[in-house]
């Protein structure tokens, strides 16, 4: 199993902990919002399947100037085996559908919760 570093603690983090922390962060950024998440920015919808973490990062990395999701972007990079830069897209994107970041986060959060309950931590 691959262990992920760079989250809440120094050194390796078990995948289950990393996934739980990502879920907690997504919940956190949706709570007690005073303004629309990322000012209502739109991102490409993705297929929530294998390779989802990289696809999610590829979509969210194109949102600039949104401090609320910076930690999420960093955490997703820990799940993605390759470096992702703005403007980079994989075949996992549903390139005909753009949704608000707020909706993207709901979709991602639900999928991650299901993975966590099913014990799929990688």
């Amino acid at each position: 199993l691959t262990c992920l570093g760079g989250f809440a603690s120094p050194g390796p983090v078990p995948p289950s902990t990393a996934l739980r922390e990502l879920i907690e962060e997504l919940v956190n950024i949706t709570q007690n919002q005073k303004a629309p998440l990322c000012n209502g920015s739109m991102v490409w919808s993705i297929n929530l399947t294998a390779g989802m973490y990289c696809a999610a990062l590829e979509s969210l990395i194109n949102v600039s100037g949104c401090s609320a999701i910076e930690k999420t972007q960093r955490m997703l990079s820990g799940f993605c085996p390759h470096k992702v830069s703005a403007g980079q897209f994989s075949s996992l994107h549903v390139r005909d559908t753009k949704i608000e970041v707020a909706q993207f986060v709901k979709d991602l959060l639900l999928h991650l919760k299901k993975l966590f309950r099913e014990g799929q931590f990688n």
């Epitope: 949706t30 709570q31 919002q33 303004a35 629309p36 608000e100 707020a102 709901k106 639900l110 309950r117």
Partner: antibody, heavy 118, light 109 residues
Framework: QVQLQESGPGLVKPSETLSLTCSVS????????WSWIRQPAGKGLEWIGR???????NYNSSLKSRVTMSIDTSKNQLSLKLSFMTAADTAVYYC????????????WGQGTLVTVSS | SYVLTQPPSVSVAPGQTARITCGGN??????VHWYQQKPGQAPVLVVY???DRPSGIPERFSGSNSGNTATLTISRVEAGDEADYYC????????????FGGGTKLTVV
């Protein structure tokens, strides 16, 4: 504590347009999705549509041609217009807030009864 | 269009466990939310995202979701649990929309 209050006419004539307002207090209207949901007497819940502060909407396909939703962030209000009303549109109309983290509804108004009759 | 099917009624004795089902094509891939509605009142969210509980909702309320069926389970049923219960999902397709089940009347006998 977030509170939602629907207001509008209790009686609408057939073929007329229903106009309802939902006033939100205790929280910002800007950061959530908001929906209108209706319930005919003794029947189940029917989703009418949703709106975000950007003005982007999703409507129930069966009502799409008759529905218009809008949002006024300065007044913390949202509105629903439903045209060409018939007796089948008689129902309690609710506004509800979509949770920030899921597609569930965590806050509801108390509902307002709208009757369509001549 | 996506359809959610609930039994019209479920009866249970006080202290027993009530199970209310919500059927839908591959519903296990969706997030299911459950509401309790008492006469003359607005619905109240009791379970969201299959099995999460909002604050203030007793632990007696729980949910599960897999395959083509989601289930709301109410353990140690009390007289005050008598109400209509609705399941709800968000259908993410080219035409995003919300769907409610037809509702189940829970009677505590």
């Amino acid at each position: 504590q977030v509170q939602l209050q629907e207001s509008g006419p209790g009686l609408v004539k057939p073929s007329e347009t229903l106009s309802l307002t939902c006033s939100v207090s205790g929280g910002s209207i800007s950061s959530y999705y908001w929906s209108w949901i209706r319930q005919p007497a003794g029947k189940g819940l029917e989703w009418i549509g949703r709106i975000y502060m950007t003005g982007r909407t999703n409507y129930n396909s069966s009502l799409k041609s008759r529905v218009t939703m809008s949002i006024d962030t300065s007044k913390n209000q949202l509105s629903l217009k439903l045209s060409f009303m018939t007796a089948a549109d008689t129902a309690v109309y609710y506004c509800a807030r979509e949770s920030g983290s899921s597609y569930s509804y965590d806050y509801w108004g108390q509902g307002t009864l709208v009757t369509v009759s001549s | 269009s996506y359809v959610l099917t609930q039994p019209p009624s479920v009866s249970v004795a006080p202290g027993q466990t009530a199970r209310i089902t919500c059927g839908g094509n591959n519903i296990g891939s969706k997030g299911v939310h459950w509401y309790q509605q008492k006469p003359g009142q607005a619905p109240v969210l009791v379970v969201y995202d299959d099995s999460d509980r909002p604050s203030g909702i007793p632990e007696r309320f729980s949910g599960s979701n897999s395959g083509n069926t989601a289930t709301l389970t109410i353990s140690r049923v009390e007289a005050g649990d008598e109400a209509d219960y609705y399941c709800q999902v968000w259908v993410s397709s080219s035409d995003h929309h919300v769907v409610f089940g037809g509702g189940t009347k829970l009677t505590v006998v």
